[in-house]
């Protein structure tokens, strides 16, 4: 229903705390370089204005759209052009073009230092002095680094952060309590960021129809007892909510997400038997819990999929006269029977079914033609199953770090033109799939592995799109979203690549490496590994193992030496010479 004042409506629905958090996220995602203090000033102004509209919906400017109000605020920032260059040109446009322009200027890889967690004591002091400001900084820092982070979910992580600090800051050993708990929140949030970026990519590149198909498959897996009409309603709502968040309509998105949670909890009987525990929680936790809900039990008496989609005489009639609905019911029926498949695989199967009907329904004897379609799914199913098997075996053999290195070598060979930091980031994330998925029960491995890999590869595509350097990457990234992972898996060594010149400085290290945290040390070594592969793309596994083993020993030896600097200065050139020789 239409409201006189959109901003008053959202303020009343969301409450002041969530309203302010969402406005802060919105501004931080649009203007990623602005300091917290500048954004918080704007947030306060917007909040005060919203309160005047709650008091009187007819007050001046209260009838303006939220995009207009937010855009006007952003465009009034002094020195906008100095700090943001081209983005300032957006301010010459009218809505909705102005908002579209802001969206196009979101930077997936902003030039910001990595978010450093303060020392435990310092963190607790500033949290206890001003919890609101502390959590505001958290929202700001995450949102500016992840301009597509799902805003209501980020509020949930801020709430988790708050809980951890409240609990741990009273402990005697604050660091021991905080570190593992905050690491867990950080890990979950980073995965959430790449997953949501994938959803926004899907929406941006392929539109609502493609996203809705994804949602139908996902919901059907989770809620196999729900009717198709119920699944369609949920998928339509989820599509609308994600479109809003991806489009910067964060207040509407969060409000609609809360509404959807309310609807699901009021209609548990027709959705799933697993919802009750979620429905007893407060709003942010309730929505998050519902988003992560375990699959309901599959109905025992489901007929064979063939009865409806192969054996019926009027398959082609349904396909011709109600194409989208028919393919939707196919996706629903197949997905509810296969919680053990990835959504990407289910969408590939639906696409294969569609292509088969497109071909067969134009032929003389359609049933004879499409009669074997289900058997033709077999290779499509086997391919990701084999991928999971071989990669999990490799992970179990090498451990996470070793597995990341194997992935790094593989991907550097596939796309050596891609920048080393991007390759290292991608390989580290791809390599985490082992820890995340390979320890799960068999039935959960495939969906975990493939849907996670798809999200990480989407991040690679988003970064590559900004500065395209590899034709092979461009080709895989330009195709359909569900074909990306198989496309990347199928890439081999890029034969067109001219190896990089061997530069001694790339492999020159200093004593500062000794004091780095383990993670940073690993990144340094992995950077060197990628550079080695760029120098010798056809180096054998044994050659690379030798060189990297030698390198690890060198670092270890010099970090234990009395005169570290001298050790690095004298042993370094020897290492470089030995490496060149080993790779000759």
């Amino acid at each position: 229903e239409a409201h006189k004042s959109e901003i008053a409506h959202r303020f009343k629905d969301l409450g002041e705390q969530h309203f302010k958090g969402l406005v802060l996220i919105a501004f931080s995602q649009y203007l990623q370089k602005c300091p917290y203090e500048e954004h918080i000033k704007l947030v306060q102004e917007v909040t005060d204005f919203a309160k005047t509209c709650v008091a009187d919906e007819n007050a001046e400017n209260c009838d303006k759209s939220i995009h207009t109000l937010f855009g006007d605020k952003l465009c009034a920032i002094p020195k906008l052009r100095d700090n943001y260059g081209e983005l300032a040109d957006c301010c010459a446009k009218q809505e909705p073009e102005r908002n579209e322009c802001f969206l196009q200027h979101k930077d997936d890889n902003p030039n910001l230092p990595p978010f450093q967690r303060p020392e435990a004591e310092a963190m607790c002091t500033s949290f206890q002095e001003n919890p609101t400001s502390f959590l505001g900084h958290y929202l700001h820092e995450v949102a500016r680094r992840h301009p597509y982070f799902y805003a209501p979910e980020l509020l949930y992580y801020a709430e988790k952060y708050n809980e951890v600090l409240t609990q741990c800051c009273t402990e005697s050993d604050k660091a021991a309590c905080l570190t593992p708990k905050l690491d867990a929140v950080k890990e979950k949030a980073l995965v959430a960021a790449v997953r949501q970026r994938m959803k926004c990519s899907s929406m941006q590149r392929f539109g609502e129809r493609a996203f809705k198909a994804w949602a139908v498959a996902r919901m059907s897996q989770r809620f196999p007892n729900a009717e198709f009409a119920e699944i369609t309603k949920l998928a339509t709502d989820v599509t609308k909510i994600n479109k809003e968040c991806c489009h910067g309509d964060l207040l509407e998105c969060a409000d609609d997400r809360a509404e959807l949670a309310k609807y699901m909890c009021e209609n548990q009987a027709t959705i799933s038997s697993k919802l009750q525990a979620c429905c007893d929680k407060p709003v942010l936790q309730k929505s998050q819990c519902l988003a992560e809900i375990e699959h309901d039990n599959i109905p025992a008496d489901l007929p064979s999929i063939a009865a409806d989609f192969v054996e019926d005489k009027e398959v082609c009639k349904n396909y011709a006269e109600a194409k989208d609905v028919f393919l939707g019911t196919f996706l629903y029926e197949y997905s509810r029977r296969h919680p053990d498949y990835s959504v990407s695989l289910l969408l590939r199967l639906a696409k294969k079914y569609e292509a088969t009907l497109e071909k067969c329904c134009a032929e003389g004897d359609p049933p004879a033609c499409y009669g074997t379609v289900l058997a033709e799914f077999q290779p499509l199913v086997e391919e990701p199953k084999n991928l999971v098997k071989t990669n999990c075996e490799l992970y179990e053999k090498l451990g996470e770090y070793g597995f990341q290195n194997a992935v790094l070598v593989r991907y550097t060979q596939k796309a050596p033109q891609v920048s080393t930091p991007t390759l290292v980031e991608a390989a580290r994330n791809l390599g985490r799939v082992g820890t995340k998925c390979c320890t799960l029960p068999e039935a959960q491995r495939l969906p975990c592995v493939e849907d996670y890999l798809s999200a990480i590869l989407n991040r690679l595509c988003v970064l590559h799109e900004k500065t395209p350097v590899s034709e092979k990457v461009t080709k895989c990234c330009s195709g359909s979203l569900v074909e990306r992972r198989p496309c990347f898996s199928a890439l081999t060594v890029d034969e067109t690549y001219v190896p990089k010149e061997f530069k001694a400085e790339t492999f020159t290290f200093h004593s500062d490496i000794c004091t780095l945290p383990d993670k940073e040390k690993q990144i340094k070594k992995q950077t060197a590994l990628a550079e080695l592969v760029k120098h010798k793309p056809k180096a054998t596994e044994d050659q690379l193992k030798t060189v990297m083993g030698d390198f690890a020993q060198f670092v270890d030896k010099c970090c234990k030496a009395a005169d570290k600097d001298n050790c690095f200065a004298t042993e370094g050139p020897n290492l470089v010479a030995r490496s060149k020789e080993a790779l000759a």
């Epitope: 729900a226 009409a229 009865a307 409806d308 054996e311 006269e321 609905v325 019911t329």
Partner: nanobody, 126 residues
């Protein structure tokens, strides 16, 4: 739960007409495809006609094509089967059936339909 209730059956002469109604209720009923089946004494239940839910699509058995017309009025949650040029072999108990939430008739196999009305008898005889 879907509930279905047929009415309109009766005795009619060959060549005559009859209109059957099926009152349907339940969640998402207007988005659910509904079918008419019939069962003659000593025979299997056979599919007669069907109509999509929220989708403008109709289905007919070859034996009734051109003589029977299926329609629905969602404002009244009622399904109709207009039967013209009736023949003695059309004599049977007519049932309406539904697969909840399924917008299309994707199968004519009676066993796949969990919800049935109690049936209405149609007798075509001179």
């Amino acid at each position: 739960e879907v509930q279905l209730l047929e009415s309109g059956g009766g005795l009619v002469q060959p060549g005559g007409s009859l209109r059957l109604s099926c009152a349907a209720s339940g969640r998402y009923i207007d988005e659910t495809a509904v079918a008419w089946f019939r069962q003659a004494p000593g025979k299997e239940r056979e599919f007669v006609a069907g109509i999509g839910g929220g989708v403008d699509i109709t289905y007919y058995a070859d034996s009734v094509k051109g003589r029977f017309t299926i329609s629905r009025d969602n404002s009244k949650n009622t399904l109709y089967l207009q039967m013209n040029s009736l023949r003695p072999e059309d004599t049977a108990v007519y049932y309406c059936a539904a697969r909840p939430g399924q917008p299309l008739i994707t199968s004519k196999v009676a066993d796949l339909y969990p919800y049935w009305g109690q049936g209405t008898l149609v007798t075509v005889s001179s």
